[in-house]
């Protein structure tokens, strides 16, 4: 999304990002689209500190994040590198179980009830979190 100077109403500011926590449930693609329409993206988790922040706000409910492997390798929706980045999968996950017969495995990642990640069928009606970055220019100290 475009950079902002302050968070929109009903969004939560944390570490120079703004977060919006859904209450209803949507399929991953619908949640992804919702965030894009808000000039944001599904949450990208880049640190343990950010993981704890998000986990605190979503509670013990399955919640989509901006991570998927619908085109092959796992990718974050904002382009953050998956291989070198933060990960918090449940043991044995992601298993990309192909038995569900949807043609491409379990292609979307979500926070589980204990906060760790799982891959699941993207059509499941889970909650989601949108994220947008604050104006990076505002982080610079003013010129004297």
């Amino acid at each position: 999304g475009s950079e902002r100077a302050c968070c929109p109403v009903n969004w939560v500011e944390h570490e120079r990002s703004c977060y919006w926590f859904s209450r209803s449930g949507k399929a991953w693609a619908d949640a992804d689209n919702y965030c894009r329409l808000e000039d944001a993206h599904l949450v990208v988790v880049t640190s343990w500190e950010e993981q704890k922040f998000v986990q605190h706000h979503i509670g013990p409910v399955n919640t989509w994040m901006g991570l998927h492997d619908q085109n092959g390798p796992w990718k974050w929706v904002d382009g953050t590198d998956y291989e070198t980045g933060f990960k918090n999968w449940r043991p044995e996950q992601p298993d990309d179980w192909y038995g569900h017969g949807l043609g491409g495995g379990e292609d979307c990642a979500h926070f589980t009830d204990d906060g760790r990640w799982n891959d699941d069928v993207c059509q499941r009606p889970y909650r989601w979190v949108c994220e947008t970055e604050l104006d990076k220019a505002s982080q610079e100290p003013p010129l004297l």
Partner: antibody, heavy 120, light 107 residues
Framework: QVQLVESGGGVVQPGRSLRLSCAAS????????MHWVRQAPGKGLEWVAV????????NYADSVKGRFTISRDNSKNTLYLQMNSLRAEDTAVYYC?????????????WGQGTTVTVSS | DIQMTQSPSSLSASVGDRVTITCRTS??????LAWFQQKPGKAPKSLLY???SLQSGVPSKFSGSGSGTDFTLTISSLQPEDFATYYC?????????FGGGTKVEIK
């Protein structure tokens, strides 16, 4: 033991309203999603609506959307179904059922049902 | 909406028979499928969830299998109390949808 008891059914004229209740006991009501499912005489089961554990998410079958409203009062351990603009095709036994989780995990426990008859 | 097709719609069997009921969905649903048993004048009873997981208290003569679009409920040895109507249901997404039911009758 886990129990769901529906009430509020009866005979009502087309176009009128009715409110069904489902009293829950034997489990922590506020941590489970709840559903309404109906069964017309001699027919199969039809899902009607779901409400998540905290009331935050509600979904309806197309056949009742805009006419029925699902709600819950966690302080009273009670689920409701407000039925407006009733039609003859709404005649059915209405069951409340507990979700296995917060609202997207399938049904496990069912009530005994309450009968709604829409007739002039 | 996801359509559920159950077959057969009815079957006649004898006590001790092995009975198989199938459920096919119009699109893949993973393993988000449940099976229910209903006797005349009674509420449905949950038998299995996640296609193959037995609900607490349900005897092991009931088993389920399948994933994607094709699912099976098997009763290994039919007993008098098993004569009832059986329904499959998908809960991958809303609206939840049921199969039309399979009535298991005494031969």
């Amino acid at each position: 033991q886990v129990q769901l008891v529906e009430s509020g059914g009866g005979v009502v004229q087309p176009g009128r309203s009715l409110r069904l209740s489902c009293a829950a006991s034997g489990f922590t009501f506020s941590t489970y999603g709840m559903h309404w499912v109906r069964q017309a005489p001699g027919k199969g089961l039809e899902w009607v609506a779901v409400i998540w554990y905290d009331g935050s998410n509600k979904n309806y079958a197309d056949s009742v959307k805009g006419r029925f409203t699902i709600s819950r009062d966690n302080s009273k351990n009670t689920l409701y179904l407000q039925m407006n603009s009733l039609r003859a095709e709404d005649t059915a036994v209405y069951y409340c059922a507990r979700d296995q989780g917060v609202g997207y995990d399938g049904l496990d426990v069912w009530g005994q049902g309450t009968t709604v008859t829409v007739s002039s | 909406d996801i359509q559920m097709t159950q077959s057969p719609s009815s079957l006649s069997a004898s006590v001790g028979d092995r009975v198989t009921i199938t459920c096919r969905t119009s699109q893949g649903i993973g393993n988000y499928l449940a099976w229910f048993q209903q006797k005349p004048g009674k509420a449905p009873k949950s038998l299995l969830y996640k296609a193959s997981s037995l609900q607490s208290g349900v005897p092991s003569k009931f088993s389920g299998s399948g994933s994607g679009t094709d699912f099976t409920l098997t009763i290994s040895s039919l007993q008098p109390e098993d004569f009832a109507t059986y329904y499959c249901q998908q809960y991958m997404t809303y609206p939840l949808t049921f199969g039309g039911g399979t009535k298991v009758e005494i031969k």
